[in-house]
């Protein structure tokens, strides 16, 4: 399954929107930073394209879920948030098209499930952190910065997959 060129453009736009969403400076929140344990190994280059597509899909789905909560709507600029949803939705569609094609359905399903579970647990840690910090502006800024970082890492994987073709 070939992801369209627009997919990587969409990823870049998503990162740009995340950058623009910043409301306060991370500098004033240095003490609030937290190691969420991004499962970088689940996005390692050793995986085949067939295995990474569902993991990438899970990552973007979780980002979508995180930013479409009531608490998120209160934290961010509505216009930027709407544009952000649109970009994520388009990327989910691109990835779903690949998943539907049944790429790699029979290939190492257990490995894939473990990776998806690791991504889910990562987002559970982020959700718990926000809850513990009572969805404060600093907590949201820390999460925004973390999502930019992890999304960028997963985007880099998409690019490396494309270049291997």
């Amino acid at each position: 399954c070939d992801l369209p060129q627009t997919h990587s453009l969409g990823s870049r736009r998503t990162l740009m929107l995340l950058a623009q969403m910043r409301r306060i400076s991370l500098f004033s929140c240095l003490k609030d930073r937290h190691d969420f344990g991004f499962p970088q190994e689940e996005f390692g280059n050793q995986f085949q394209k067939a295995e990474t597509i569902p993991v990438l899909h899970e990552m973007i789905q979780q980002i979508f879920n995180l930013f479409s909560t009531k608490d998120s709507s209160a934290a961010w600029d509505e216009t930027l948030l709407d544009k952000f949803y649109t970009e994520l939705y388009q990327q989910l569609n691109d990835l779903e098209a690949c998943v539907i094609q049944g790429v790699g359905v029979t290939e190492t399903p257990l490995m894939k499930e473990d990776s998806i579970l690791a991504v889910r647990k990562y987002f559970q840690r982020i959700t718990l952190y926000l809850k513990e910090k009572k969805y404060s502006p600093c907590a949201w800024e820390v999460v925004r910065a973390e999502i930019m970082r992890s999304f960028s890492l997963s985007t880099n994987l998409q690019e490396s997959l494309r270049s291997k073709e």
Partner: antibody, heavy 123, light 107 residues
């Protein structure tokens, strides 16, 4: 590409003020903090302070509080650092630096630097 | 303020040598430590962030380790272009503070 371009060298008399500019290009100006760091001749690096170009929020090291003013002009993507009541010890190269890389941003490592502005304070 | 102490303040080494620079924080800073390289008349360059993450475009001969109060920058095989001054910087809490620097000179 991401660039920070600073204003030229300045020579000032003790007691005067100096205003150094730093023009950003190649990225979304309001999305990343800009820091100011100085280096006296033959000495190490010293953090002066930072500004959030979006909100104008600033924070300065205690050593400079009351003497430093950091401002920004979003229309020209430029930040300014003004240091008043200059003394000979303020003779240094002044750098502006931003944090653009995503990992670096989280760990607040300055990954893009201006070329530096030499400020000489002499009577 | 958090004090950052670097050692040694200077060292002489030859091309191909393994070089180690240490940085100690006056209190625990977790892994919020960055390393910079600076050459005469030039702006500093970020080498490593988060104690051990290599900044994009930096050669893999540079590596960082440590957490808490003790950190190390290692150059596995010194190259002619590596002769410079190296600084550590903490980003754990404001104000940001730098180590005094370590000058790496040609033996």
């Amino acid at each position: 590409q991401v660039q920070l371009v600073q204003s030229g060298a300045e020579v000032k008399k003790p007691g005067a003020s100096v205003k150094v500019s730093c023009k950003a290009s190649g990225y979304s100006f309001t999305s990343y903090d800009i820091n100011w760091v100085r280096q006296a001749p033959g000495q190490g690096l010293e953090w002066i302070g930072m500004i959030n170009p979006s909100s104008g929020f600033t924070s300065a090291a205690q050593t400079f509080q009351g003497r430093v003013t950091m401002t920004r002009d979003t229309s020209t993507s430029t930040v300014y650092m003004e240091l008043s009541s200059l003394r000979s010890e303020d003779t240094a190269v002044y750098y502006c630096a931003t944090i653009k890389g995503l990992g670096a941003y989280y760990y607040y490592g300055m990954d893009v630097w201006g070329q530096g502005t030499t400020v000489t304070v002499s009577s | 303020d958090i004090q950052m102490t670097q050692s040694p303040s200077s060292l002489s080494a030859s091309v191909g040598d393994r070089v180690t620079i240490t940085c100690r924080a006056s209190q625990s800073i977790d892994r919020y430590l960055n390393w910079y390289q600076q050459k005469p008349g030039k702006a500093p360059k970020l080498l490593i962030y988060a104690a051990s993450s290599l900044q994009s475009g930096v050669p893999s001969r540079f590596s960082g380790s440590g957490s808490g109060t003790d950190f190390t920058l290692t150059i596995s095989s010194l190259q002619p272009e590596d002769f410079a001054t190296y600084y550590c910087q903490q980003s754990y809490s404001p104000p940001l503070t730098f180590g005094g620097g370590t000058k790496v000179e040609i033996k």
